[in-house]
Amino acid sequence: KLLQVSTIAMQQQEKLIQQERALLNFTEWKRSCALQMKYCQAFMQNSLSSAHNSSPCPNNWIQNRESCYYVSEIWSIWHTSQENCLKEGSTLLQIESKEEMDFITGSLRKIKGSYDYWVGLSQDGHSGRWLWQDGSSPSPGLLPAERSQSANQVCGYVKSNSLLSSNCSTWKYFICEKYALRSSV
C-alpha cells in the first residue's frame, strides 16, 4: 500500500516537472513572439517613413554603414527606453562587432562625455544568459564587463568604451538603432 502511494506521488511529481517545463517553454515562445511582432511593427514603420524621406537616416541620427543611430538626450529606465525607440521604428542598440562598438564609443566621445547609455541587452532571469532584444546572444568579446549585484532584472549599458550592467530600473540615456535607407541610384 505504502509503495503504491509513493509510486503515485513520484508520478505526480514527474508530471508537475513536465508541466513546469512546458510552461517555461511557452513563456519563452510567447516572449519571442511578442518581440518579433514589435520588430515587424518597427520595420514597417521604418519602411513607411522612409518612403517620404530620401536621406539614409532621419534628422539628428548618425549613420555608420547600414545603420542609423540616435543618441538620446532624455533619461528613461530600460523598458521605457526600448519603447521610445520602438515608436521611432527602431530598437535599442544591438552591437554586432568590435568595429560597431568602436564607432559608437568614438561618437559618444565626440557628442557628450562619459555618460551611461542603455543598449538592447538584458539578462534572462532563468538562465542568467545575456540576450539581445532579437533573442540572439552577444559575441564573447561583447559581454558586460561586470556582473551587477542587483536582485532585480539586469540590463546592459555603454559607458566610455565599456559595456556594463545595471538594474534595469535605473535612469540612463539610451541609443536607438535602425536600418539606414539604401539610396536608389
Epitope: 532624455i74 528613461s76 521605457t80 519603447e83 515608436k87
Partner: nanobody
C-alpha cells in the same frame, strides 16, 4: 481629435514650486505619449518630460531630472508636472502635447500653453 487644456502656471520666486495640470479629452490616448514641452522667449521649443499613456513609461529631459516629477490620474485623464526648486531659467510657456513619438520633438496635438515665470 485630442483636446488638451493646461492650467497651474503663474509667477513664483526662485526656489519655489508649481504644479501644472494637463486635462485631455476627445479620442483615446492609448497610442500617445502625453508630453510637456516649454518655449522660452527667443529659444526653441524643448521637451521637458513625457509619459506613454498605455504603459506609464516616463522620460525626462536633463533640465527636469531631479527637480520635476511627472504623474498621471487615469480616471481624470490628467497628467501633472510637479516642478520644484524652480530657477529663473525655467521661465517659459509650458505646452502639453499628445505625441506618437517622444524623440522627434514634434507632436500630433497641442494645448494652448500656460505661462510660468520664475523671478529671482
Amino acid at each position: 481629435q485630442v483636446q488638451l487644456q493646461e492650467s497651474g502656471g503663474g509667477l513664483v520666486q526662485a526656489g519655489g514650486s508649481l504644479r501644472l495640470s494637463c486635462a485631455a479629452s476627445g479620442r483615446t490616448l492609448s497610442n500617445y505619449a502625453v508630453a510637456w514641452f516649454r518655449q522660452a522667449p527667443g529659444k526653441q521649443r524643448e521637451l521637458v518630460a513625457a509619459i506613454w499613456w498605455a504603459s506609464g513609461g516616463i522620460s525626462y529631459a536633463n533640465s527636469a531630472k531631479g527637480r520635476f516629477v511627472l504623474s498621471r490620474d487615469n480616471a481624470k485623464n490628467t497628467v501633472y508636472l510637479q516642478m520644484d526648486s524652480l530657477k529663473p531659467e525655467d521661465t517659459a510657456v509650458y505646452y502639453c502635447a499628445a505625441a506618437s513619438s517622444v524623440l522627434s520633438g514634434t507632436a500630433d496635438y497641442w494645448g494652448q500653453g500656460t505661462q510660468v515665470t520664475v523671478s529671482s
